[in-house]
Interface confidence: medium
């Protein structure tokens, strides 16, 4: 590992369409790939009127958005689905929405999806 | 170097049946996701068949599913399409690609492909 | 299933040119979208995955943006090795769809 890196060797895995999608339900997920590729994690989720619905968990390929990122935080304001990336095992088991443009409190507090 | 060759290919009369197999190189096997991918002679790209990096979860395309199997033996490093009841709409290139997770990353690799022709 | 639905379907193009290529996806599919490109009787080749990420040895022309329904490959200046069908991927649910290609030709 690199010093003061973060390496990805697992990831919480969710997926909501897990039934068509043939997978498990929740569990920890693996995370492969190219020795000279970065790995990390991500979650999806949506706020429908105040209540989180996870829509996915699992293992993301190099990017470079979610390098050196080990909280899993979305940025973007006002999105229809939440995605955010990170680096360091399970660093998805909790994520939040900060959106850049607003310097006030976060519109929602960190979440810890429950099995 | 990472590779994938097909094989198995070939001519084949409707209602017939065919196995086809990607052999493996250059990773390692065990961990990925692998895939089957058609492309009939002048279209475009229609996946398959999909498995996961041992074997407990297949998924197929609707236009295959009950007639093609997947399978893996990664004690060898093979990938396998197992094709009954050949329709002339299955003749295509046939492509297998690795992935890295089961679902939701990139086809990064592919095969050659191997040519099926259902025909009589 | 997602329905992914490239456009154009060709384009005639001259070495050096800015080339863009888009794809619209039947429901949001986030960052799950990836590009290939596939030469006559060769195999397709991922270029662009994740939406952005460019894959490996593939140069910095190439480039992709977009999230929810849609995405766009941009070619920044056309090189002769860059005349090719390009397909876009959803991955965001099996089963895996593709677009229809579209077919980079020379004018």
């Known amino acids: 590992a690199i010093l003061g890196r973060s390496e990805t060797q697992e990831c919480l895995f969710f997926n909501a369409n897990w039934e068509r999608d043939r997978t498990n339900q929740t569990g920890v997920e693996p995370c492969y790939g190219d020795k000279d590729k970065r790995r990390h994690c991500f979650a999806t989720w949506k706020n429908i009127s105040g209540s989180i619905e996870i829509v996915k968990q699992g293992c993301w390929l190099d990017d470079i958005n979610c390098y050196d990122r080990t909280d899993c935080i979305e940025k973007k304001d006002s999105p229809e689905v939440y995605f955010c990336c990170c680096e360091g095992n399970m660093c998805n088991e909790k994520f939040s929405y900060f959106p850049e443009m607003e310097v006030t409190q976060p519109t929602s507090n960190p979440v810890t999806p429950k099995p | 170097e990472v590779q994938l060759l097909e094989s198995g290919g070939g001519l084949v009369q409707p209602g017939g049946s065919l196995r086809l197999s990607c052999a493996a190189s250059g990773f390692t096997f065990s961990s990925y996701s692998m895939n089957w991918v058609r492309q009939a002679p002048g279209k475009g790209l229609e996946w398959v068949a999909g498995?996961?990096?041992?074997?407990?979860?297949?998924s197929y395309a609707d236009s295959v599913k009950g007639r093609f199997t997947i399978s893996r033996d990664n004690s060898k490093n093979t990938l396998y399409l197992q094709m009954n009841s050949l329709r002339a709409e299955d003749t295509a290139v046939y492509y297998c690609a690795r992935s890295a997770n089961w679902h939701d990353t990139a086809l990064d690799y592919w095969g050659q492909g191997t040519l099926v022709t259902v025909s009589s | 299933d997602i329905q992914m639905t490239q456009s154009p379907s060709s384009l005639s193009a001259s070495v050096g040119d800015r080339v863009t290529i888009t794809c619209r996806a039947s429901q949001s599919i986030l960052s799950f979208v990836n590009w290939y490109q596939q030469k006559p009787g060769k195999a397709p080749k991922l270029v662009i995955y994740a939406a952005t990420s460019r894959a490996s040895g593939v140069p910095s022309r190439f480039s992709g943006s977009g999230s929810g329904t849609d995405f766009t490959l941009t070619i920044s200046s056309l090189q002769p090795e860059d005349f090719a069908t390009y397909y876009c991927?959803?991955?965001?649910?099996?089963?895996?769809?593709f677009g229809g290609g579209t077919k980079v030709e020379i004018k």
């Open positions: 991927q959803q991955s965001y649910n099996l089963p895996l769809t």
């Open positions: 498995i996961n990096y041992n074997g407990g979860y297949t």
